[in-house]
Interface confidence: low
Amino acid sequence: VPRWRQQWSGPGTTKRFPETVLARCVKYTEIHPEMRHVDCQSVWDAFKGAFISKHPCNITEEDYQPLMKLGTQTVPCNKILLWSRIKDLAHQFTQVQRDMFTLEDTLLGYLADDLTWCGEFNTSKINYQSCPDWRKDCSNNPVSVFWKTVSRRFAEAACDVVHVMLNGSRSKIFDKNSTFGSVEVHNLQPEKVQTLEAWVIHGGREDSRDLCQDPTIKELESIISKRNIQFSCKNIYRPDKFLQCVKNPEDSSCTSEI
């Protein structure tokens, strides 16, 4: 008789999850010499240990501490790029501007990017059928707690000028409920961070509005200023040209507004 299994509202664990995490770890440590010392089997064991046999609505940051310890990594603190609702462009940017880093350019972010996972209380099984949805089921689920933990640590590590890419096509350009708005903003360290510089990415080709005047951006500015961090904002009117100019800075068109 098959055991009764909790049905959650969200999609189940990504297929071949253990193999994917292990393969990503091996690939990352091969590409990044400073992480060559990492034992990927230990990383997987620590990852697994954070959620296996635990109720998937009762995960804590503490559960991830062994994984955090194994994945400790130093990135240049003044070259951090945060993003909100515009992941693809942020990643395209750091693929070209190799000295800047998003969270997903670090080992732990790379391992978990676009994956879903959860277990079941009191069994060693991974649940491939369903996992808790943040809104409909519970916020303390394995995926949400993981991203909250690594995002907090990433923001805490930042210094000098921190950049954030925001999606100017969304109704809330800055969303207080996003990971950026709820975690990263509040964990930037004022004693280390001079300025948060927002890049608002425009969607429409003919959109010449100054989205830095958007009420949600003003809200972000207010939150940041109250934390004794300077704020600045720039419109990126042509994201295609922006990327092109990062790739080919000598292009004569790159001295004009992007």
Epitope: H163, Q194, E197, V246, P249
Partner: nanobody, 121 residues
Framework: EVQLVESGGGLVQAGGSLRLSCAIS???????MGWFRQAPGKEREFQAG????????YYADSVKGRFTISRDNTKNTLYLQMNSLKPEDTAIYYC???????????????WGQGTQVTVAS
């Protein structure tokens, strides 16, 4: 490769103004730029910085309210407007590009040759 050429230095009376320029040639898409100065017998020190992307500006306490850094991307030029000059502002002024940390004079990818500013009392 980036070349930086400063101009605009010279002799000026105390209380006067000067505008320094730094012409940038070569690779122009560089993150942070700044102005530094070195007085005789002293270390080179940060005066003002600006980020390429957003144009955020930073100043040493000694020049806040008197100096203004700006840049014109269309002319590939960095500027330093210096007002209310004092004799202690006398120094060689250097333009720097690709600052690793704004305010840290030891780490920049590119430096100009410098331009002399002398403020007479």
């Amino acid at each position: 490769e980036v070349q930086l050429v400063e101009s605009g230095g010279g002799l000026v009376q105390a209380g006067g103004s000067l505008r320094l320029s730094c012409a940038i040639s070569g690779r122009t898409f560089i993150a942070d730029m700044g102005w530094f100065r070195q007085a005789p017998g002293k270390e080179r020190e940060f005066q003002a910085g600006i980020t390429w992307f957003g144009g955020s500006t930073y100043y040493a306490d000694s020049v806040k309210g008197r100096f203004t850094i700006s840049r014109d991307n269309t002319k590939n030029t960095l500027y330093l407007q210096m007002n209310s000059l004092k004799p202690e502002d006398t120094a060689i002024y250097y333009c720097a590009a690709g600052l690793k940390r704004i305010g840290d004079q030891r780490e920049a990818d590119y430096w100009g040759q410098g331009t002399q500013v002398t403020v007479a009392s």
